[in-house]
Interface confidence: medium
């Protein structure tokens, strides 16, 4: 039975040209995290494997930095980076947990972070 929940940074915004940390946290389970995938709508951004470390998708090598922790730092933001991001936690023995973050990249200098929220 899957008892865990994914807590994410929720709806967030950031300035064009800046950077943002995408962060998820798995709680309420003792399952072992074997791998975390970071995806953007229809593309893979990066993978963090418990044994092998980080794989950054070649398309994003120049703009994505691993961490902090299992999170991901997205740099040199453009308006095209606006959209949904997913953290996919592969765990044993529970299976797969998915969290969602919505990022809005703003032209203006006003970029406020949204509230945290949970996805069961």
């Amino acid at each position: 039975m899957m008892t865990g929940t994914i807590e994410t940074t929720g709806n967030i915004s950031a300035e064009k040209g800046g950077s943002i940390i995408l962060q998820c946290h798995l709680s309420s389970t003792t399952a072992q995290v074997t791998q975390v995938n970071w995806e953007q709508q229809d593309q893979l951004l990066a993978i963090c494997n418990a044994d092998l470390g980080w794989h950054i998708s070649p398309s994003f090598k120049d703009r994505v930095a691993p961490g902090p922790g299992l999170g991901l730092t997205l740099q040199s933001l453009t308006v095209n980076d606006t959209g949904e991001y997913f953290c996919i936690y592969h765990t044993y023995p529970d299976g797969t947990y998915t969290g969602r973050i919505f990022l809005e990249v703003l032209e203006s200098s006003v970029a406020e972070h949204g509230a945290r929220f949970q996805i069961p």
């Epitope: 995806e39 229809d42 092998l52 998708s57």
Partner: antibody, heavy 118, light 107 residues
Framework: QLQLQESGPGLVKPSETLSLTCTVS??????????WGWIRQPPGKGLEWIGY???????YYNPSLKSRVTISVDTSKNQFSLKLSSVTAADTAVYYC??????????WGQGTLVTVSS | EIVLTQSPGTLSLSPGERATLSCRAS???????LAWYQQKPGQAPRLLIY???SRATGIPDRFSGSGSGTDFTLTISRLEPEDFAVYYC????????FGQGTKLEIK
């Protein structure tokens, strides 16, 4: 355990397009655990990576073949495919499909020989 | 592009002996990104070692991998008749490349 099976014509004429399909069983091609790749091996020679696709559709190709390669995925059929255009005799090889964890290739098809000849 | 050079090209040994196969990279490779495969005639390659030193599922413990940076080694501690095959190293940097292979043959 994953099983992969290549299928497609064994003979292709020069300048035409080579088309192969890989059918995955024992697991879902929509798993975010895997990349789905193609590797080839000319007779008596070593291995050359062609490219891979992620289930969401993003692809990455060997730069030396990029202009001629297209890899696509059909999640409804649990298959992925390779198209290699403008083939020459140098493209004659055993073509393998394989699953990749992003670092290495853990499950392989048995391979299919494709000969380019008129 | 990272070029992998394997040596020797052919290694002739007898069952029961120890085999040491070398793989040298043209530039430094993260240990996480180095794997070894075994290929027998008419068969697909089989993953033996990943992450430079971790054995894949079902691989006997007579196979071991070691190394870091530019120099990696596959060791078969005591050769069995079924171990005679071609061995390839493979790395993942920004793209995958394979070594040219080492043929392990019966002396």
């Amino acid at each position: 355990q994953l099983q992969l099976q290549e299928s497609g014509p064994g003979l292709v004429k020069p300048s035409e397009t080579l088309s192969l399909t890989c059918t995955v069983s024992g697991g879902s091609i929509s798993s975010s655990r895997y990349f789905w790749g193609w590797i080839r091996q000319p007779p008596g020679k070593g291995l050359e990576w062609i490219g891979y696709i992620y289930y969401r559709g993003s692809t990455y190709y060997n730069p030396s073949l990029k202009s001629r390669v297209t890899i696509s995925v059909d999640t409804s059929k649990n298959q992925f495919s390779l198209k290699l255009s403008s083939v020459t005799a140098a493209d004659t090889a055993v073509y393998y499909c394989a699953s990749s964890s992003a670092w290495y290739f853990d499950y392989w098809g048995q391979g299919t020989l494709v000969t380019v000849s008129s | 592009e990272i070029v992998l050079t394997q040596s020797p090209g052919t290694l002739s040994l007898s069952p029961g002996e120890r085999a040491t196969l070398s793989c040298r990279a043209s530039q430094s490779v993260s240990s996480s990104y180095l794997a070894w495969y075994q290929q027998k005639p008419g068969q697909a390659p089989r993953l033996l070692i990943y992450g430079a030193s971790s054995r894949a599922t079902g691989i006997p413990d007579r196979f071991s991998g070691s190394g870091s940076g530019t120099d990696f080694t596959l060791t078969i501690s005591r050769l069995e008749p079924e171990d005679f095959a071609v061995y390839y190293c493979q790395q993942y940097g920004s793209l995958y490349t394979f070594g040219q292979g080492t043929k392990l043959e019966i002396k």
